[in-house]
Interface confidence: medium
C-alpha cells in the first residue's frame, strides 16, 4: 500500500512540526493504525502510535508527543517538544487493521529539521 | 570545473547559515571570484560576491550579508540576517579569474532552511 508524506518539514521555533501522511487505501478500512518512526544514524525508534476508527479522531497516549486528526485517507500529524537533537527522518507507517485483509504501507520518511531557539535575555 | 557544497544547511535561530564551497582547481589560480546565487521559485538572484587573492581574506562589500574565509581550494561562507522567507537553494559559483585560462564552476546548491524565532516575551 502506497503511503505519501512530505520530504522535508521544519519544526517551528517552539519545537513543533506538522505534516500530512496520506495513504492509498485498497479497500474500505474502518480501523486504521498510524505509527511514526524516527530513523537517525541507522537506528529506528518508535515515536508514537495511534489507532482510530474512520471518521473519528486519533487517540494517542496521554504522554505522547504526537497529536493528530484524520480526514478520509489523510492523517495530519503534529509532533511537539522537539529539540535540535531530534532532527531526523520521521517515517509514517499505516496499517489497515479491520476489516480483513490487512494492509501495511510505509512512507519514505519526512526529514524534520529542528533548531534550538536562542534563550531570551533575562528580564531585570 | 567541479564545485562541491553541502546539500542541506540549517540557519541558526539567529538567522546565520554557514557552509563550505570547495572547488577542484585545474591550475594555479592566484585570483578567485566566488558568487552566491539564490534559486527560489525558478528565480535566480545574486546574494553576494567576492574576489580574493589566494592566501588572503575574502572582501565582500561592507553592506553584504555574506562573510567568508578561504583556505586553499575551500571557501567557508557565512550568510547572516536570514529570515524564513529566505529559505531556498543557495548556489556557489567559482571563477578562476587570473592567471589565464579562465575557469568557471557552479555547485549543485545548498538548501538553506530558515525558521523565524518566536519573539521573546516583553520584560515587565
Amino acid at each position: 500500500m502506497h503511503v505519501a508524506q512530505p520530504a522535508v518539514v521544519l519544526a517551528s521555533s517552539r519545537g513543533i512540526a506538522s505534516f500530512v501522511c496520506e495513504y492509498a487505501s485498497p479497500g474500505k478500512a474502518t480501523e486504521v493504525r498510524v505509527t511514526v518512526l524516527r530513523q537517525a544514524d541507522s537506528q529506528v525508534t518508535e515515536v508514537c502510535a495511534a489507532t482510530y476508527m474512520m471518521g473519528n479522531e486519533l487517540t494517542f497516549l496521554d504522554d505522547s508527543i504526537c497529536t493528530g486528526t484524520s480526514s478520509g485517507n489523510q492523517v495530519n500529524l503534529t509532533i511537539q517538544g522537539l529539540r535540535a537533537m531530534d532532527t531526523g527522518l520521521y517515517i509514517c507507517k499505516v496499517e489497515l487493521m479491520y476489516p480483513p485483509p490487512y494492509y501495511l504501507g510505509i512512507g519514505n520518511g519526512t526529514q524534520i529539521y529542528v533548531i534550538d531557539p536562542e534563550p531570551c535575555p533575562d528580564s531585570d | 570545473m567541479h564545485v562541491a557544497q553541502p546539500a542541506v544547511v540549517l540557519a541558526s535561530s539567529r538567522g546565520i547559515a554557514s557552509f563550505v564551497c570547495e572547488y577542484a582547481s585545474p591550475g594555479k589560480a592566484t585570483e578567485v571570484r566566488v558568487t552566491v546565487l539564490r534559486q527560489a521559485d525558478s528565480q535566480v538572484t545574486e546574494v553576494c560576491a567576492a574576489t580574493y587573492m589566494m592566501g588572503n581574506e575574502l572582501t565582500f562589500l561592507d553592506d553584504s550579508i555574506c562573510t567568508g574565509t578561504s583556505s586553499g581550494n575551500q571557501v567557508n561562507l557565512t550568510i547572516q540576517g536570514l529570515r524564513a522567507m529566505d529559505t531556498g537553494l543557495y548556489i556557489c559559483k567559482v571563477e578562476l579569474m587570473y592567471p589565464p585560462p579562465y575557469y568557471l564552476g557552479i555547485g549543485n546548491g545548498t538548501q538553506i532552511y530558515v525558521i523565524d524565532p518566536e519573539p521573546c516575551p516583553d520584560s515587565d
Partner: nanobody
Amino acid sequence: QVQLQESGGGSVQAGGSLTLSCAASGYTGDLVAWFRQTPGKEREGVAAISRTGLTTYYADSVKGRFTISQDTAKNTGYLQMNSMKPEDTAMYYCVAGWHVGGTWYKTSSYDYWGQGTQVTVSS
C-alpha cells in the same frame, strides 16, 4: 628590468586630498600595492589591487578615505587619498609582486619596490 616610479607626493592640509601615481615598466606580477613608513616604524600596507582590478584590499585605517585603482593600458597604479589626517604623514611606496599565496599587507609578498614619495599632512 622592472622599475616602479612613484609621483604625486607633497604637502597638504588636514582634510585635503592627494593622488599618488605609480608608473611601472615591465610586467610586475599579479598585485600592485601601496605601503607607507614613518621613521622608526615598520612599513605598513595601505591598499592593494589585483591585475584584473576586481580585488582590492584596504587597511582599516584608510577604508572609506583612500581608493586604489589602476590603468592597465598605461601600466600605472593610483592611490586617491581624501579626508587626509596628520597620521597619514609618511613615505609612500608603490610595490608589486607575483603574489602566489602571500598576504597582501606583508612586505614579503612583493618582489618590486619603488623609491618612495613623501606625503606630509599638517593640521
